[in-house]
Every structure is written in C-alpha cells, then in structure tokens.
C-alpha cells in the first residue's frame, strides 16, 4: 500500500515573502500543504487539522494555536481550539474561518494542514467455516486458542456491551467524539445506535457466533447514531489508545478500524504512527466498489486492510456499490450475510455486510495469532495472515480489468495451528501505485520496515517500460520502475520478505559492450542470489536473446539484455539457500508462469529477454507471472518466446529453530 | 472485589406484591445484566428474566406470564425484581446474579407466602 | 422452557472421578457454547465451576472440567474429596432465554 494517489486534492499555498510579525519563521524554502477531500460532500469546513513538524513538542503546540488565535482575533476572525494533539502526532484541531488558511500555513511548524472531513460505518454463519480450517467443523468450532492475551480496540458507534453474547467481553471507555446527527427530525433510538457496534463486537469475540471467543475489546465511540464520525475524531481515539498504551502497557494491542473517508494523510500518519508503536490496525477497505486507495485509514500502508467475500468466496456486491479492491488490500474475508449480535435485544442475532464485518473477521483471526505468538511483529502477523489464506479462489471478474493484477486472491483463514509457522520463509508481493504517463516517470515500491527487499520487477500494460532498479532511500532498499516513451505507465513491484539477521545488497553490471547479453553475479562469500532486476535507457529493447539461466550453470547469476543494466539482489542470512527455476516457451504466449515447489518461497521473478514486448513480471503468492503482448500483435516469431525465471529460496536456520523449540 | 447485595427477607399474603433489591458493586455495570434466578424449598434454579444497567432493556422466562417486573436504577448500582399477584407456590429463595453469565451471585433473598 | 436433564443423583469414594451429564436439545446445550456449572452446598448460593462449556473461573480447582458432545454436555471431577459433596445444575443457552437442568446430588461416600 502506498499514499501516493493522484486523485488526492492538494492546494499548495506558498509561503510569502513578509512575515506578519511572527516571532520565529518557517524553514527557509519549507512549504506547507492544505489538503482536503477529494469527495466534496464528505468535507467538513470550517474545522482543520493543523499538523506540525515531527519534532514539535507540546509547549510549541500549544504556543502555534496561541499565536493562530491572536493574529486571527487582529484579523477580526474569531477561532476555537478543538483538541491539542500529542502522543501520537504533534498538531492541532481548530474551528475557523477558510480565509485564515493562507495565514495558519506561514504559522512555525506547520508541515501541512487538513480540512475536516466524515468517515462512516461500512456495513450494510458460513463465516465461520471458510476461515476455519478443514480439521475443525463449524458447528463446534473451538479456536487453538481464543485470542485472551489480546485486547482489541474497536473504534465505531456506541455499543450495547451487556448483549449476551459479548457480556463480560467489553470494556466501554469513556471515550466520545462524535458529530451531530444529520436532520433536524432525527430520532436517536438506542438499538439503532448501537448496532453496528454491537453487530462487529460479537463477530470479534462473541460467544456463540465470534471469531475469537476469548478476546476482550474496549470500545471508543467515534461514529453517530447515524454510523457517521470525523476524521478528527477518529485522530483523537487513535491518539487516546495511544496514551492509554503508555501508561498501561498491556499485551498485544489489536485496533479495529470499520470505517472509512476519503483519502487522508492525517489519518494514514496517524496509523503509521501507533503501527510503529506496535499496535496492529485492521480496518475496512470500503464499500464502494471503488479502488481502495482513494480511502482512508484504507490506503495507509501500515494497516492490515480487508476487503469482503461471500459464502462463494466472490467479492462481495452491496446495492449498486460492494467491496473495494486494489493494491491497497491486503486480503479479503467473509462480508457478506454476518450472523453476529444484534442491539434489538439483548440475545437477538442479526445478519450485516460490508467490510467492516470482513475486518472484524480479521481482527479475530490477528487476536488469536497474537495470543499464540505474543512476541510477532506487524510485518510477521501480515506476512501469516498472508500466508494462511485461501488461494486463488476469488473470481477475478468482478474487479475492474485493469485492478485484476493489482488486487490479492486471497481470503482470510485460521491457521491450522497457531503454532509452528517459524520455520517458514515469508514472503508478500507489495504493488506500487501508478507511475502516470510522462516520459520520466517513476513508480516506487516498498517494504515494511522490518522486512527485506529481495526483488524488485515492474509491469506495463503497454509493454512501453525502462524496466526497474534496486535503489537506496532513506537507509532502505526501494524498487523503482520506469515509464518508457510513449507508455501508459508502470507498476513497480517489490518482493517483501522476513528474513531475520539479513544482510543485503545490489550488485549492477552496466549495458555490456558485446553481444553476449549483461550479467552480474553475488561475488561475496556466503552470499545468495534472491532477486533480478534490468533497467535500460533506451525506449526499445531489440530482439536481442541473451543466454537463458541455468539452474545447474551459475545459480549466482543474472542475465539480461546487451543494453540493460543488471541488477542482482545478494543476500546473506543465516540457513539461505535459494535456486533458480525457469519455465520457457518457444512460442509466444500471452502469460508464462513458474512456480516453486513446496518448501520453498518465491522471493525473485523476471522475464527473460527483456524485450519490448514483454509487459512485465511479478510474484502471485509462490508463482512467477510473466506477461507478454497480446500473441496476435507479436506474430509467431522467435521474438514470442519468453522465459519466466523464478528465485526460490528457504531458511534451513529457520526450520532447524522452529524444530527446537517444538 | 465484584459483590452483589440483595434484600432482607419478606413475608407475604397471597395477592400481595414483593420488590427485592440487589445492589451491584466493584465491576462496570454496563458490561452486564441482571439475572433474577428463584429456588423453591427442596427445588431446582429456576431462570427467571433479566434487566439491562445499559438500557433498562428486559427478557423474562415465559412463565413469569406478566406477573413480574426486572428494573434498573443505575445512580444507585440497584437492580430490583417485583413479584405482583403472590401465590404460596412464589415462596422461594429469590437470587440476582450477574449478567446471563451468572458467574457472580447475590446472597439470597427468602420470600415466604402465606396466609 | 423445559428443564435440562441430568442425574438425579451420583456417588463416589474420595479420589475417585465421576461424571454427570446434562442432556438437552440442538436448540439449547446443542446450539450454543455456553453451557455453565453450578455448585450448591445446602443453604448457600449456587458457585460457577464451569462457563462456556470448559473454562474454568479463577479460583476453582483444576480437578473440575466440562465437555460438550452434540447435544450433551458433562462434568467431571476427579480425585473427589468430602467437600465436593453439594448439589451441580448445568445451564444453558437458549435462543432467547436460559435453562437450568433439575439438578444431581452428588454424595462423597
């Protein structure tokens, strides 16, 4: 997932020359942002989120709003301090007119400031049994365990906490920030309050109907009677779980997020940074059958975000709309037809649908995980929740054509056993957003932090590509693709895997002067090839063939077009041993794959030869996709032949310590 | 520490009403309901409804037959069950217990009918 | 709502085990994970022992266990000693309301 979505309206104000006699001055150079919702009828004007620098303390918190209300009051214009942020991100919430915009951006610390906009509810007993695995019956599922060393934060109406089938389960905090009911002749009725609330506590923990039975949740009202809430208001619980988190360290903390705005850096800074403080966050990915990356907290890269599935295991349809999709998912579960708790009465049961429902499915699936392995990171329980999943079993056509290749086949499911998964070497495929059409542009894809780039590739659906590269930003290894001339633009896709102790690098041999074809080997002692890469200056790669690897000849080696540069991505760990699999065709086809075998992961895919009519490759769960022209626009000559090179890799040092500790 | 403190006994003449009361302590009373469970001398627990702290929302056993009445007072942390139109077969140990989970109980309140 | 049925009574020599059973229907015990156990001495207020079918509340001792098969669900207790001697109902679920079993009567002889 990536926040990097053109369709996020921004207004830059640049800063002027004079100072209005302000004490301290903004950064020479610096300028901040205004961003709003793309969505107009979901913007909140009036009330803006005033983000300040990283490093802000408190006292200069307090001290800009000070300074924003008194230039204001010389202006005439009357504001309110809302809410002063900190624990989480330095800034404040202040009511105040459009016009004094201009003026809060020249404001000391200001990094960028956000309008106010609404997020709501997205929810509109077979679920059970498609994310249990087979071994259990649905009728008597008894999870491996029930989730009990887990608290899970849910953040969404009020909820009726006495139900019998969540009693005991939740612990209402006193937190509530919510906006007025719309309409003068709303009628607040209590049941009707509480229901979606109620509805995804019992899918988390109920008894009779949850996914983990022994969780306990806490729960903040952030959304109305209406099933509607702020973005602000969801900032302040984020920042309230937070503070809790500090003076109360408990176990493993699990945030149910079952809502969604428009796209929001705010809210996606806010989830990095609990993400980062080692909460998990799950949250829906929509409903409204509309790319997920156009919606928060769906879009933001540190949150587990899930779309939904039916009893079919096909996306879920809602009215006119159903569940998001894209690059920006990480999985799918079940969202459709939900029997869980129902606020009607205290053991009424009713059936909802939506994506909230699907992540509250997941949210149960991460408690129960987290109570086996207390100890995983975000990185290890997404890579498992990842792993565990139902393959391949979502019926692609739903999604829009050109979302297909973005979108994960997956659906959520339990682990066999909860334990044991530690010898595995994890690996996900994490897709970046749309490079554009220019003639330079880029597309950057990256890992978590605490996993490693093994391999990067790139796709177009032109075919009009430079390739890709490994590069360095920011201390960390990204992949990088380039636009060709001409092209529609590029995805670049990263291999993202777990591999503890990892000590990795890129080695690049330039375009080679002979005809022989570019290659680059891991020259250092102990290290192995994970990855390849290619990336070339000109627009068109002729139709040279270069010599196809071999698994027997040099395991260690990359090879690529005369007029590529070849990237190899070395590594060292551990028990890392990879090899090399191929799968040729000599005519042409459309689609080549390959794929590694049992025990083993796929951390490295590419095409060979890197020509012009190549789309692309890439890494669908342990399968090497690559992707050609259409067969009718490339003829039947040598050029159609294509060979899908995969890197299959294992950890013996993680087996040999997974079998220990059993 | 979680307690539940209920009423003293009461004598009755059939016809008449009894109000017992039962006081929560020492846990979120919003988290849970009232049970109202009666035993009869030589007898088994009998459910007999519950009520909200939350809502005031009810649930009673079908054989209460409009007879009784399950309120909440949650300023007082009192919960209370009214028995109207008494027979001698009401006489019984009334208990409140906690929530449908029933994992903490009152200590018991004797109401005997007789003329 | 009928009653759950279980035992009227059952007997054992300390350190023994016994079970009793509490049989009901797929709309009660069969339907649901929350069967419960409770311990009555004479004249004092019933104890849990055994919620959800298996757990155990803190404080009780680990010789007592519940299982659930179909529409039955029992009690064990093993290494029976003199104080275990009380009346146990079972309860459970039901779509909207709970009931309890009649009862069983456990000596310790």
């Known amino acids: 997932q990536e926040d990097e979505d053109g369709d996020y309206e921004e207004l830059v104000l640049a800063l002027r020359s004079e100072e209005d006699g302000l004490a301290e001055a903004p950064e020479h150079g610096t300028t901040a942002t205004f961003h709003r919702c793309a969505k107009d009828p979901w913007r909140l004007p009036g009330t803006y989120v005033v983000v300040l620098k990283e490093e802000t303390h408190l006292s200069q918190s307090e001290r800009t709003a000070r300074r924003l209300q008194a230039q204001a009051a010389r202006r005439g214009y009357l504001t309110k301090i809302l809410h002063v942020f900190h624990g989480l991100l330095p800034g404040f919430l202040v009511k105040m007119s459009g016009d004094l915009l201009e003026l809060a951006l020249k404001l000391p610390h200001v990094d960028y400031i956000e309008e106010d906009s609404s997020v709501f509810a997205q929810s509109i007993p077979w679920n059970l049994e498609r994310i249990t695995p087979p071994r259990y019956r649905a009728d008597e599922y008894q999870p491996p365990d029930g989730g009990s060393l887990v608290e899970v934060y849910l953040l969404d109406t009020s909820i009726q906490s006495d139900h019998r089938e969540i009693e005991g389960r939740v612990m209402v905090t006193d937190f509530e920030n919510v906006p007025e009911e719309d309409g003068t002749r709303f009628h607040r009725q209590a049941s009707k309050c509480d229901s979606h609330g109620t509805h995804l506590a019992g899918v988390v923990s109920g008894r009779d109907a949850g996914v983990a039975k022994g969780a306990s949740m806490r729960s903040l009202r952030v959304l109305n009677c209406q099933g509607k809430g702020t973005v602000s208001g969801t900032l302040i619980g984020l920042e309230f779980i937070r503070k809790s988190q500090l003076v109360q360290p408990v176990g493993p903390l699990v945030v149910l997020l079952p809502l969604a705005g428009g796209y929001s850096r705010v809210l996606n800074a806010a989830c990095q940074r609990l993400a980062r403080a080692g909460v998990v966050l799950v949250t829906a990915a929509g409903n409204f059958r509309d790319d997920a990356c156009l919606y928060s907290p769906a879009s933001a890269p540190e949150v587990i975000t899930v779309g939904a599935t039916n009893a079919q295991d096909q996306p879920v349809t809602l009215g006119t709309l159903g569940t998001n999709f894209g690059r920006c998912v990480d999985l799918f579960a079940p969202g459709e037809d939900i029997i869980g708790a129902s606020s009607d009465c205290s053991t009424c049961f009713v059936s909802q649908s939506g994506t909230s429902q699907a992540a509250a499915h997941v949210a149960g699936i991460a408690a129960m995980m987290l109570s086996a392995e207390p100890e995983l990171t975000l990185a290890e329980l997404r890579q498992r929740l990842i792993h565990f999943s139902a393959k391949d079993v979502i019926n692609e056509a739903w999604f829009p054509e050109d979302q297909r290749v973005l979108t994960p086949n997956l659906v959520a499911a339990l682990p066999p056993s909860t334990h044991g998964a530690g010898w595995q070497l994890f690996c996900r495929t994490v897709w970046s957003a749309h490079s554009g059409p220019t003639r330079m542009a880029t597309a950057v894809a990256r890992c978590a932090p605490d996993e490693e780039l093994l391999s990067c590739s790139s796709f177009s659906r032109s075919g009009k590509r430079r390739g890709e590269r490994m590069e360095a930003q920011g201390g960390k290894l990204v992949c990088r693709a380039h636009n060709a001339f001409g092209g529609e633009g590029v995805y670049a896709i990263a291999r993202c895997c777990l591999l503890p102790q990892a000590n990795c690098s890129v080695h690049t041999a330039p375009p080679a002067e002979a005809s022989m074809g570019t290659r680059v080997h891991c020259h250092q002692q102990g290290h192995v090839l994970t990855g390849c890469s290619s990336h070339w200056e000109v627009e068109d790669l002729g139709t040279h063939k270069p010599p196809v690897l071999r698994p027997r000849g040099q395991p260690n080696q990359c090879v690529g077009h005369r007029e590529a540069s070849i990237h190899a991505s070395c590594c060292h760990a551990p028990g890392l041993e990879c090899k090399v699999k191929e799968h040729g065709i000599p005519a042409p086809q459309e689609q080549v794959t390959v794929a590694c075998e049992e025990g083993w992961t796929l951390t490295g895919c590419s095409a060979l030869p890197g020509t012009s009519h190549v789309l692309g490759a890439y890494a669908v769960d342990n399968t090497c996709v690559v992707r050609s022209r259409d067969v009718s626009t490339t003829g039947s000559t040598s050029e159609g032949a294509v060979t899908a090179v995969a890197i299959c890799c294992r950890s013996r040092h993680l087996a040999q310590a997974s079998q220990e500790l059993q | 520490q979680v307690q539940l403190v209920q009423s003293g006994a009461e004598v009755k003449k059939p016809g008449a009403s009894v109000k017992v009361s039962c006081k929560a302590s020492?846990?979120?009373?919003?988290?849970?309901?009232i049970s109202w469970v009666r035993q009869a001398p030589g007898q088994g627990l009998e459910w007999m409804g519950w009520?909200?702290?939350?809502?005031?929302?009810?649930n009673y056993a079908q054989k209460l037959q409009g007879r009784g009445t399950m309120t909440t007072d949650p300023s007082t942390s009192t919960a209370y069950m009214e028995l109207r139109s008494l027979r001698s077969d009401d006489t019984a140990v009334y208990y409140c217990?906690?929530?449908?989970?029933?994992?903490?109980w009152g200590q018991g309140t004797t109401v005997t009918v007789s003329s | 709502q009928s009653a759950l049925t279980q035992p009227a009574s059952v007997s054992g020599s300390p350190g023994q085990s016994i079970t009793i059973s509490c049989t009901g229907t797929?709309?009660?015990?069969?339907?649901?994970?929350?069967v419960s156990w409770y311990q009555q001495h004479p004249g004092k207020a019933p104890k849990l022992m055994i919620y959800e079918v298996t757990n155990r509340p803190s404080g009780v001792s680990n010789r007592f266990s519940g299982s659930k098969s179909g529409n039955t669900a029992s009690l064990t207790i093993s290494g029976l000693q003199a104080e275990d001697e009380a009346d146990y109902y079972c309860n459970s679920y039901t779509s909207t309301s709970m009931v309890f079993g009649g009862g069983t009567k456990l000596t310790v002889l």
């Open positions: 797929s709309s009660d015990v069969g339907g649901y994970n929350s």
């Open positions: 020492g846990y979120t009373l919003t988290s849970y309901g």
């Open positions: 217990a906690r929530g449908y989970g029933m994992d903490v």
């Open positions: 009520v909200s702290f939350y809502n005031g929302n009810t």
